[in-house]
């Protein structure tokens, strides 16, 4: 019986470890600066790195600019978006800017899109200063179902900071759904 | 056999509980205001509390101003940095400020330092107002190896808000590395 | 013995799954816009949704405008607060605003209230622009005891953005206390 108990313990450790890892999807996606759209209106950002630098993904899928949930659960979602302008980049079309991020969830089954989180600020980026910068951070805890998609929309995408430490979003599973 | 099963269950509950606790390092470090450096360029903040007020640490080490990882894993890292100026605080030399935070990872094995997250804003703090305030929050999910170090760099450290609820950073382990 | 082992494994999977769920309280509360207080001073926000839209709660209690902890543990707490003003809403009393959030913990046993996190910014919302917006995000890792209460205080509540994606706070348990 002792040997059997040891075997139970052993198999359990493996099983617990394995199931724990399988139960914890995550992603951290960093902006792909080679493909940032232009314009000042709200646009969806579709180009992100998931496999270089700080970018990584596990038990989730990145496809067509969207982060796809493969496993039901409650997830913590976050985004950090940085905007910047230097006078050497040329004049801004306007000094009054609305710098915003929207983290949206799309359900394929019921074709609909909903904003989970938003953040940002109106800014006055005057010509008296040669450099301007602003960052937004949002985060929250959401129930996500397999097949649902997370995407990022921003205003003024041409002002995005292309560094991987500046503009990114991510998710990690915290717990199962009851 | 039933008694044995009960024993297995009992030992398992203990083992699961114990291993779960051991597997979840965390830290929440609050600014030590008695030792804030001066300067206007990016400086590293080395004085933090880990054992008073909201400051706490477990299965990680705080040494030489850096948060040291003791256990490989994926961690959620975060920082909240507040800057403020009151007309009684001193003679502010410029209205145009770049208030920034950089969360950096240093690998000892391969001596190199990389910025994981950055945030902040350029601000115009005019003399027309007697008080100014601004906070930055950043957060993200990163793979950290044992021995790696996390540190915080800021611009304009003399403007930091010294309250424990204002200027802090932290980390908690979410899952093992596969 | 093999049958017994299978039974052990089976009961263990159920037990582990069940105890894991029971051990992970969470809440995501979104602003109830029908009951936002007026004024420009610091006020406690007591009206939140916990059961509609993105609002949800499990193994925690929402009562009298406070999020009550039912289970000791280390929790990640977060808040996202958005302020906005459009010229059609009427003139602002002042163009110089202090837009702030305070996440506070109240202990019933020892009647005392402490600020865990604060964030925000002073803003100059000039009449030259027809629309103004600003968001704050804070987050941190804290030890919470059963019976303790989390509440949100803000300045200028009449400027709050009433959308569920804009103004919310939440918590999720990460680990037990040793």
């Amino acid at each position: 019986i002792r040997a059997e108990k040891a075997m139970v313990d052993g198999s359990w450790l493996d099983l617990a470890k394995r199931s724990k890892l399988e139960a914890q999807p995550f992603a951290h996606l960093t902006i792909n600066a080679t493909d940032i759209p232009s314009g000042s209106h709200k646009v969806s950002l579709s180009s992100w790195y998931h496999d270089r630098g700080w970018g990584k993904i596990s038990n989730m899928t990145f496809s067509n600019g969207k982060l796809i949930v493969n496993q039901d659960g409650f997830y913590y979602l976050y985004a950090n978006i940085c905007f910047r302008h230097h006078e050497t980049s040329g004049d801004l079309a306007t000094e009054y800017l609305q710098l915003m991020v929207y983290v949206t969830k799309t359900s394929i089954k019921i074709p609909s899109s909903h904003t989970l989180m938003k953040g940002g600020s109106t800014k006055y980026w005057s010509g008296n200063s040669e450099f301007h910068f602003y960052s937004i951070n949002v985060g929250g805890f959401f129930k996500l179902r397999s097949g649902e998609e997370i995407s990022i929309e921003v205003s003024n995408p041409s002002l995005l900071d292309p560094d991987q430490d500046a503009t990114y979003f991510g998710a990690f599973k915290v717990r199962d759904i009851d | 056999i039933r008694a044995e099963k009960a024993m297995v269950d009992g030992s398992w509950l203990d083992l699961a509980k114990r291993s779960k606790l051991e597997a979840q390092p965390f830290a929440h470090l609050t600014i030590n205001a008695t030792d804030i450096p001066s300067g206007s360029h990016k400086v590293s903040l080395s004085s933090w509390y880990h054992d008073r007020g909201w400051g706490k640490i477990s299965n990680m080490t705080f040494s030489n101003g850096k948060l040291i990882v003791n256990q490989d894993g994926f961690y959620y890292l975060y920082a909240n940095i507040c800057f403020r100026h009151h007309e009684t605080s001193g003679d502010l030399a410029t209205e145009y400020l770049q208030l920034m935070v950089y969360v950096t990872k240093t690998s000892i094995k391969i001596p190199s330092s990389h910025t994981l997250m950055k945030g902040g804003s350029t601000k115009y703090w005019s003399g027309n107002s007697e008080f100014h305030f601004y906070s930055i929050n950043v957060g993200g999910f990163f793979k950290l190896r044992s021995g790696e170090e996390i540190s915080i760099e800021v611009s304009n450290p003399s403007l930091l808000d010294p309250d424990q609820d204002a200027t802090y950073f932290g980390a908690f382990k979410v899952r093992d590395i596969d | 013995i093999r049958a017994e082992k299978a039974m052990v494994d089976g009961s263990w999977l159920d037990l582990a799954k069940r105890s894991k769920l029971e051990a992970q309280p969470f809440a995501h509360l979104t602003i109830n816009a029908t009951d936002i207080p007026s004024g420009s001073h610091k006020v406690s926000l007591s009206s939140w949704y916990h059961d509609r839209g993105w609002g949800k709660i499990s193994n925690m209690t929402f009562s009298n405008g406070k999020l009550i902890v039912n289970q000791d543990g280390f929790y990640y707490l977060y808040a996202n607060i958005c302020f906005r003003h459009h010229e059609t809403s009427g003139d602002l009393a002042t163009e110089y605003l202090q837009l702030m959030v305070y996440v506070t913990k109240t202990s019933i046993k020892i009647p005392s209230s402490h600020t865990l996190m604060k964030g925000g910014s002073t803003k100059y919302w000039s009449g030259n622009s027809e629309f103004h917006f600003y968001s704050i995000n804070v987050g941190g890792f804290f030890k919470l005891r059963s019976g303790e209460e989390i509440s949100i205080e803000v300045s200028n509540p009449s400027l709050l953005d009433p959308d569920q994606d804009a103004t919310y706070f939440g918590a999720f348990k990460v680990r037990d206390i040793d």
């Epitope: 008296n128 | 001066s38 206007s40 001193g90 003679d91 410029t94 209205e95 003399s158 | -």
Partner: antibody
């Protein structure tokens, strides 16, 4: 070449007024806080006024507060010091000085003008 | 106001000598001290800031040290062109105050 050139000094009666100017060139004037520092006949250096880069903050020691006013015109790259209710102890060489970049609360001076002399007679 | 005291009004030295000038603050100024050189008939020139940082273009024979209330400015090997008055200034808190100056004379 970075240069500061003061003007406007001269002889003035006690209780009188005088306006000093400082023309800046060779650097982006609007990016720097500026000060006036005087040197007494005994060769002591005294800081008398400071102004932030954008001009919305002005600072003075108690000895001149209410009598001296520092201002700037960033469009014309010029610094001013309006002095009134002058006293004999205000007699000095007045230097225009650029505050070096550094901690936002700390002022030291990396570029000085050649100075202009102010003599207050009783 | 913080009072800065340079106890030696004059110091005499020879070319090639090492010379140290001291400055004392009436209260703790951490490391917020600058040193200036003023040659005869000229304006002051910044040499050292934040107690020990050499300003751009300043020869490395000029060094500064100290923290708190006691500060030292050193010329490791005096040159003839170093004939000047040397002033300390605290940049810790307003009003910004200067020492009375130390005149370095070459024998």
């Amino acid at each position: 070449e970075v240069q500061l050139v003061e003007s406007g000094g001269g002889l003035v009666k006690s209780g009188g007024s005088l306006k000093l100017s400082c023309a800046a060139s060779g650097f982006t004037f609007r990016n720097y806080a500026m000060s006036w520092v005087r040197q007494t006949p005994e060769k002591r250096l005294e800081w008398v006024a400071g102004i932030s880069s954008g001009g919305t903050y002005t600072y003075y020691p108690d000895t001149v507060k209410g009598r001296f006013t520092i201002s700037r015109d960033n469009a014309r790259n010029t610094l001013f010091l309006q002095m009134s209710s002058l006293r004999s102890e205000d007699t000095a060489m007045y230097y225009c000085a650029r505050r070096d970049y550094g901690d936002v609360y700390e002022w030291y001076f990396d570029v000085w003008g050649t100075g202009t002399t102010v003599t207050v007679s009783s | 106001d913080i009072v800065m005291t340079q106890s030696h009004k004059f110091m005499s030295t020879s070319v090639g000598d090492r010379v140290s000038i001291t400055c004392k603050a009436s209260q703790d100024v951490r490391t917020s001290i600058a040193w200036y050189q003023q040659k005869p008939g000229q304006s002051p020139n910044l040499l050292i800031y934040s107690a020990s940082y050499r300003y751009t273009g300043v020869p490395d024979r000029f060094t500064g040290s100290g923290s708190g209330t006691d500060f030292t400015f050193t010329i490791s090997s005096v040159q003839a062109e170093d004939l000047a008055v040397y002033y300390c200034q605290q940049h810790y808190s307003s009003p910004w105050t200067f020492g009375g100056g130390t005149k370095l004379e070459i024998k």
